[in-house]
């Protein structure tokens, strides 16, 4: 860990100042206590080493203490999204002291200088809560320092200047620019306090990541693979504005961390849960719905502490917006083929019917390609709770819906003139429910009838708890 | 009882400078924004800008950038707005507004208004 | 800018009467649940007076018989029932985003 900073005047030297208040030195990190979820409340300011403040305000020195950090700014105000995390951490926490980190001055500065300005802030936050500490019943492992995008740094430089451990650090899609990639003193890392969780919503790997792609903490959460948000996309935006840009996008994509942070303390109910995967690729193929090892965990502000050697990175998908909580499946199709079917790939969808509702109809991603003769995983997931599932409705598209389907039906037939009908046969489908963990097996309802082709559809019932099959044998594939 | 008292009328020509006061009461000056709205006679309220009575960091609307300073006396409580190189189309009430930092920042307590005469 | 029109721009009511003034935004004012729009008065020869705040929250002091409403993009002003001393000019305001904007205003009048 790097060594706290010296004399004051170095601090002072390191501060990137506004011109503007240049002749004015002036403290330029604020603690607003927030003490009413009535956002229009202006609170109370703490000021170091006067006690006075924190008796007059209720600070309550045995309950959790939280410190919101904001990122960078263009417009020197508080945005929208604040107000909500305050009051979610009222609603969830009542007796909980909320602590704003007031930055503005420092971080509505050119991006670099505001970058440049985070070690001072979160030294100023480490001073606060040395002088916290010495108050009797105060602990640092009752504090959890939650920082959105340029925030989540400052939390890391905090956690790490502070005298101590604090308990917990939730960096909100921490910022990626001059972060990424960077030594571990010199940005959020798992020992910048007992817990560090991470939410990433906007990380490329194409342009610029606004937000960083790299697991900076203990868990490291990719809702959607991390990059692109659902109800974020230009046509959603617009379709909610006179007028829809690729900032607002930009913006949708990076705060929804925070409102996923949000909907974890408002939504106790309606948990969402991420699984451990190597990639997102992985995981959009169905491979990752293990609870096993500590493999799944819940987001946000109901993350289960796991302290892991090395990173945890995590997958889930989510809804358009509040409550984001969706069900996951993984299902298991052996693909048999008894005609050569050249290189076409099949367009599936699937229905699901549960004792408590039926879904929507579902299109099974193919991520790489169907495996014919082989057992192929698909991922799929549903916004409602369908309860029990009892029968799987699977369809094969026929007409095309693109040229380029049309392009490779059309060159499969070219190679292949004399295979007038394309068929896969599929005896069963294995679920496994990620929310659940529970396993089923489904058969065919006919099973002389196990064939599908384009603009045909199987049906599956369930027939067994569990995968293991009696008297399993793989058939002859025949070859024409 | 919250208050925010401008200075008196001014008559002032083409070129000249003026300096209008905002001196607020009953709350803590830092903790509210200071904003700035100019209404030109017979017409609406155009923002100007505000200043970030804390910090001192003073942010101006797009119609507002050049001639216009937004400025502080932190010990008297006290806001600033001084117009430079003054023009005809300058002739209006200036009020200044606070804003909460929190919340939805509405203007809830508005100034007494300063109307600015520019004549030759 | 957010761009707010207001309609119509001047208005006569009878006492007792309703009075309803319309405010239109050029895009959405909300945010998640909270509409960030809000409703001034101003009398001649005085400063702006916050009446309504965040759609339909009244400001301290303000008589119940100011309620506002809507979402999105549209707002209404209602005054029930109006009285003489509501004679004034009636601007919405959005700070959704800087910078703040007003709208054109709307001149009540007594028939």
């Known amino acids: 860990s790097p060594t706290p900073f010296g004399p004051e005047g170095q601090l002072e030297d390191e501060l990137h100042k506004p011109k503007a208040i240049q002749t004015e030195v002036k403290p330029s990190v604020r603690f607003n206590l927030r003490t009413s979820k009535d956002p229009e409340h202006e609170g109370c300011y703490l000021s170091l080493g006067h006690s006075q403040p924190l008796e007059d305000c209720g600070f309550n020195m045995t309950a959790k203490t939280f410190f919101i950090i904001h990122g960078w700014t263009m417009s020197g105000i508080f945005e929208n999204w604040l107000h909500k995390l305050v009051s979610a951490l009222h609603t969830r926490e009542k007796d909980a002291n909320v602590v704003v980190v007031d930055w503005l001055p420092l971080a509505h500065q050119l991006y670099t200088d505001a970058v440049n300005n985070t070690r001072v802030v979160g030294h100023s936050i480490a001073r606060m809560l040395d002088w916290l500490q010495e108050k009797d019943d105060f602990s640092l492992e009752n504090v959890h320092l939650i920082g959105y995008s340029l925030g989540a740094h400052v939390a890391g430089y905090a956690g790490n200047f502070v005298k101590g451990t604090v308990g917990r650090i939730t960096g909100l899609d921490p910022a990626g620019p001059m972060f990424e990639g960077a030594d571990i003193h010199k940005r959020l890392s798992p020992d910048d306090a007992d817990f560090v969780d991470v939410l990433h919503t906007y990380t490329r790997s194409f342009g610029l990541s606004i937000g960083i792609q790299m697991p900076v903490g203990h868990i490291d959460i990719y809702p959607n693979g991390g990059d692109f948000q659902p109800g974020c996309g230009l046509n959603d935006v617009l379709g909610s504005m006179a007028y829809g840009t690729i900032t607002e996008v930009v913006k949708c994509e990076h705060e929804r961390a925070v409102h996923l942070f949000v909907d974890s303390l408002v939504n106790q109910d309606k948990p969402s849960f991420a699984f451990q995967c190597t990639d997102s690729n992985r995981f959009k193929k169905g491979i990752c719905l293990s609870c096993r090892k500590n493999r799944c965990n819940s987001i946000g502000y109901n993350a289960k502490k796991m302290r892991n050697k090395r990173n945890s990175k995590m997958y889930l998908k989510t809804r358009a917006g509040m409550p984001f909580r969706v069900y996951h499946y993984q299902m298991k199709i052996h693909v048999f083929s008894y005609k050569n079917m050249g290189e076409i790939e099949p367009t599936f969808y699937v229905t699901l019917y549960g004792t408590n509702a039926d879904s929507q109809t579902l299109p099974l991603e193919i991520v790489e390609r169907i495996e014919q003769n082989a057992t192929n995983t698909f991922l799929v997931y549903t916004e409602e709770d369908l309860g029990d599932l009892l029968k799987i409705q699977l369809t094969w598209e026929g007409a095309s819906q693109s040229w380029y389907n049309l392009w490779k039906e059309l060159r499969s037939y070219l190679s292949q003139p004399h295979n007038p009908g394309r068929e896969l046969n599929i005896r069963r489908i294995r679920v496994k429910s990620g929310e659940t963990q529970r396993k089923l097996t489904f058969c065919a309802e006919d099973p002389e009838n196990t064939s599908i082709s384009p603009g045909r559809e199987l049906w599956f019932r369930k027939c067994r708890d569990g995968w293991r099959m009696k008297n399993e044998t793989s058939p002859t594939v025949e070859l024409p | 009882q919250i208050h925010l008292v401008q200075s008196g009328p001014e008559l002032k020509k083409p070129g000249e400078t003026v300096k209008i006061s905002c001196k607020a009461s009953g709350y803590t000056f830092t903790n509210y924004g200071m904003n700035w709205v100019k209404q030109a006679p017979g017409k609406g309220l155009k923002w100007m800008g505000w200043?970030?009575?804390?910090?001192?960091?003073?942010t101006y609307a797009g119609d507002f950038k050049g001639r216009f300073a937004f400025s502080l006396e932190t010990s008297a409580s006290t806001a600033y707005l001084q117009i430079n190189n003054l023009k005809n189309e300058d002739t209006a009430t200036y009020f200044c507004?606070?804003?909460?930092?929190?919340?939805?920042?509405?203007?809830?307590?508005w100034g007494t208004g300063t109307t600015v005469t520019v004549s030759s | 800018d957010i761009v707010l029109t207001q309609s119509p721009a001047s208005l006569a009511v009878s006492l007792g009467q309703r009075a309803t003034i319309s405010c239109k935004a050029s895009?959405?004012?909300?945010?998640?649940?909270?509409?960030?729009m809000h409703w001034y008065q101003q009398k001649p020869g005085q400063p702006p007076k916050l009446l309504i705040y965040?759609?339909?929250n009244l400001a301290s002091g303000i008589p119940a018989r100011f309620s506002g409403g809507g979402s999105g993009t549209d707002f209404t002003l209602n005054i029930h029932p109006v009285e003489e001393e509501d004679v004034a000019t009636y601007y919405c305001?959005?700070?959704?985003?800087?910078?703040?904007?007003f709208g054109g205003g709307t001149k009540l009048e007594i028939k």
């Open positions: 200043i970030n009575t804390y910090s001192g960091v003073p």
């Open positions: 895009q959405s004012v909300d945010y998640d649940v909270d509409s960030y």
């Open positions: 305001q959005q700070t959704i985003e800087d910078p703040p904007t």
């Open positions: 507004a606070r804003r909460g930092y929190y919340g939805r920042r509405y203007f809830d307590v």
């Open positions: 965040a759609a339909s």
